[in-house]
């Protein structure tokens, strides 16, 4: 990119550059028209018969350098061939010299700085590539010369350019003073500012475009070369912020349209909102869940929205005394999630009718909640209680939902309690053929003991045919027809309205060997 400091083609007023010395044959300003019929200013000199050593100087106005370190001067000029000039002496030249002088302000006068090399700095002696020929009475013909010179390095606020003629017949048609700068550049969503190179190459820090954020790694930079070109090199660059995608050749970030989102910064484009979500504004980093749908805290921002599951189905119960096995089917609606678990709530009602949450004496296997399989075993049920179990299905968003959790209920009533096992059997009398037994009345929770059943057999006779039973309504019994001096194993169970209780522990008793021993009370 070129930034113009002076372009005589664009000057509408007289240039009024300074000439030295004030003598005839000096540079003179002329006006004319360019190709577009715009008025342009030129300078002309033609003192080919000048005195030896006489130079004609022409100096521009003061030109602020505007931060440029090197300035370029493009000269357009025509040069009359010395042979075309009938009056041209040996002093006729076909070259001229260009100088510059730096200053911090427009301080030059008609006489200062001294019109000579040092203080003026010589840039170049310019020779014409194309000479213009002039024949008497005919129009001059010849090409325009174009020469670009480089001035610098410059350090002061501005400078003057000067032209020294030492015997040429020439016209300076235009002067274009400019410096080169690297134009503002946007690449990889990184904006590099317009930069005037101060050296061969200058590192330039970039900044992210609007709605972009720096990519990981070193901050982006690019090199501006002295010729005003950016050096080609990879740029780490920036990436569009969440809710924005790269557009227009990676030069800007565009907000995601309604109904789309981009959850993270970086590459990638806006995506349609996932299931059960929507975005009503542009620039969404996340889509809002529809009413009744949620994202768990651990769900990615781009995950679909999900809902709690429906209730489990078809709960089946199998009661076994004080144990209960519950089993059910998965819910019809999982809510769109894989993290399905089950939980149980329990209420118990006593025989009298008062109900409360289940007590701590119940145990659940594997547990009352966070069940991943659709079953549980409940132990410690109390007899003659009615239990209500509510089986719920849960997932990662159940805790976010408001309102009641759907459940599948099951009611189970346990049997009334049978009497406890009878223990503490005593032999009150024994004979060679009989045994009299007594025991304590067990405490039956569900009503009085109606009767007892005594089960006995001779020790060593294990088969079912050797086992005998005796019923008694009292808490005692006499076993007759026993073998002399034999050992017997005895068990007793009690019966209430709830049914028989379990047999107690086996009690070991022995008959007498002969009658002479008589009845003898024995304590087992």
């Amino acid at each position: 990119l070129e930034e113009t400091l002076l372009n005589t083609k664009l000057e509408t007023a007289d240039l009024k550059w300074v000439t030295f010395p004030q003598v005839d044959g000096q540079w003179e300003e002329l006006s004319g028209l360019d190709e577009e019929q715009h008025s342009v200013r030129t300078y002309e000199v033609c003192d080919v018969q000048r005195a030896p050593g006489q130079a004609h100087w022409l100096r521009t106005g003061w030109v602020p350098r505007r931060g440029a370190v090197h300035v370029y001067a493009t000269l357009r000029f025509t040069m009359l061939e010395c042979l075309s000039l009938p009056r041209a002496g040996r002093s006729c030249k076909e070259t001229f010299t260009v100088f510059y002088y730096e200053s911090d302000a427009d301080t030059a006068t008609a006489l200062t700085p001294a019109w000579m090399e040092n203080p003026y700095i010589k840039v170049d002696t310019v020779a014409a590539e194309h000479l213009t020929r002039k024949r008497p009475g005919a129009e001059a013909t010849g090409k325009v010369n174009v020469k670009t010179l480089r001035l610098g390095p410059l350090s002061k606020a501005g400078f003057y350019l000067a032209f020294q003629d030492q015997g040429a017949c020439m016209a300076l048609l235009s002067l274009h003073l400019f410096y080169k700068k690297c134009a503002q550049l946007t690449v990889n969503l990184t904006r590099f500012p317009e930069t005037v190179p101060r050296e061969l190459v200058v590192p330039v820090a970039g900044s992210c475009v609007v709605d972009a954020v720096p990519a990981p790694g070193p901050s982006p930079s690019l090199y501006c070369r002295e010729d005003g070109q950016w050096a080609e090199q990879p740029v780490t660059g920036c990436s569009c912020a969440p809710g924005f995608e790269a557009a227009e050749g990676n030069t800007k970030c565009r907000a995601c349209a309604q109904g789309t989102f981009k959850p993270l910064s970086g590459e990638g484009s806006c995506q349609p909102c996932p299931a059960n979500s929507h975005s009503n504004t542009i620039g969404s980093a996340v889509c809002q869940c529809r009413v009744g749908y949620f994202r768990a805290r651990t769900d990615p921002r781009g995950a679909p929205c999900t809902t709690p599951p429906s209730a489990p189905r078809s709960v089946v119960s199998r009661l076994n005394g004080s144990s209960l096995h519950l089993e059910w089917s998965a819910p019809l609606e999982s809510g769109g999630r894989e993290d399905l678990t089950y939980a149980l709530r329990c209420r118990e009602c006593r025989p009298g009718g008062s109900c409360a949450p289940c007590g701590g004496d119940l145990t659940f296997d594997p547990g009352p909640r966070d069940l991943v399989e659709p079953w549980v075993v409940v132990r410690g049920l109390r007899p003659d209680f009615t239990y209500t179990f509510e089986v719920t299905a849960l997932n990662g968003v159940s805790s976010l939902a408001t309102g009641p959790v759907p459940f599948e209920p099951v009611n189970v009533t346990t049997d009334r309690e049978v009497p406890p096992a009878v223990s503490d059997i005593r032999v009150t009398r024994s004979s060679p053929s009989s045994l009299s037994l007594a025991w304590a009345v067990p405490r039956a929770p569900s009503g009085a003991v109606l009767d007892y059943e005594v089960k006995y057999h001779e020790k060593g006779a294990e088969g079912p045919s050797s086992v005998r039973f005796l019923k008694t309504s009292e808490n005692r019994a006499e076993l007759r027809g026993l073998k002399r001096g034999a050992s017997y194993l005895v068990q007793v169970r009690a019966r209430s309205e709830a049914g028989y209780g379990p047999f107690g522990q086996e009690h070991h008793s022995q008959t007498q060997l002969d009658e002479s021993e008589g009845w003898r009370e024995q304590l087992a």
Epitope: D14, L30, L33
Partner: antibody, heavy 126, light 108 residues
């Protein structure tokens, strides 16, 4: 010798037309930009019109634009001013003037008039 | 466009210095030319490019231009210098020319 001689002036009624001529001699006419300048009786100088060497550029003062036409015939070394729709305020001595010439590039000229004719009087009156 | 303003008249004793001014906005940034016109004659260029003198013009004629004012100076004024003097410059409009109103120089 180097000179410019105007002719064609005279008395003309308002709304009428007149054509002035300026014959150049003693210099290369086809290298010179030319102009017309007028001077009303007892008044100052007023620039009227310019023409470049090739005749493809012309410029006019606002007071005459659309009514006057400058032209030249380089083969006859003559400059012209065609004046139409003349008004009383156009009454003046009309001078033909040469602009300062370039050494060799006739696309350009100096901004001063370095040669003048003796003038011709144009009177617009009924 | 620029307007050039001159005093209508200036008087000077013979041998003295006459100064005729020509003013206009930022006139110092434009080249000013001066013309002398004697009664019944065509104008003659006496100063061009602010301060240059055409060949044949006496050295007593000089010019300067800065700020908003250009000045024609006649040193050692002679009776033959009595005339009307006009300044001129480019206008900002392409290639157009404007004249000052003229100053009548009287040599007493």
């Amino acid at each position: 010798q180097v000179q410019l001689v105007e002719s064609g002036g005279g008395l003309v009624q308002p709304g009428g037309s007149l054509r002035l001529s300026c014959a150049a001699s003693g210099f290369t006419f086809n290298n010179a930009w030319m102009s017309w300048v007028r001077q009303a009786p007892g008044k100052g100088l007023e620039w009227v019109s310019n023409i470049n060497v090739q005749g493809d550029y012309t410029g006019y003062a606002d007071s005459v634009k659309g009514r006057f036409t400058i032209s030249r015939d380089n083969s006859k070394n003559t400059l012209y001013l065609q004046m139409n729709s003349l008004r009383a305020e156009d009454t003046a001595v009309y001078y033909c003037a040469r602009k300062g010439m370039s050494f060799y590039n006739n696309k350009y000229a100096k901004s001063m008039f370095d040669l003048w004719g003796q003038g011709t009087l144009v009177t617009v009156s009924s | 466009d620029i307007e050039l303003t001159q005093p209508p008249s200036v008087s000077v004793a013979p041998g003295q210095t006459a100064r005729i001014s020509c003013s206009g906005d930022n006139l110092g940034k434009k080249y000013v030319h001066w013309y002398q016109q004697k009664p019944g004659q065509a104008p003659v260029l006496v100063i061009y490019y602010d301060s240059k003198r055409p060949s044949g013009i006496p050295e007593r004629f000089s010019g300067s231009n800065s700020g908003n004012t250009a000045t024609l100076t006649i040193s050692g004024t002679q009776a033959e210098d009595e005339a009307d003097y006009y300044c001129s410059a480019w206008t900002t409009t392409m290639m157009h020319i404007v004249f000052g109103g003229g100053t009548k120089l009287t040599v007493l």
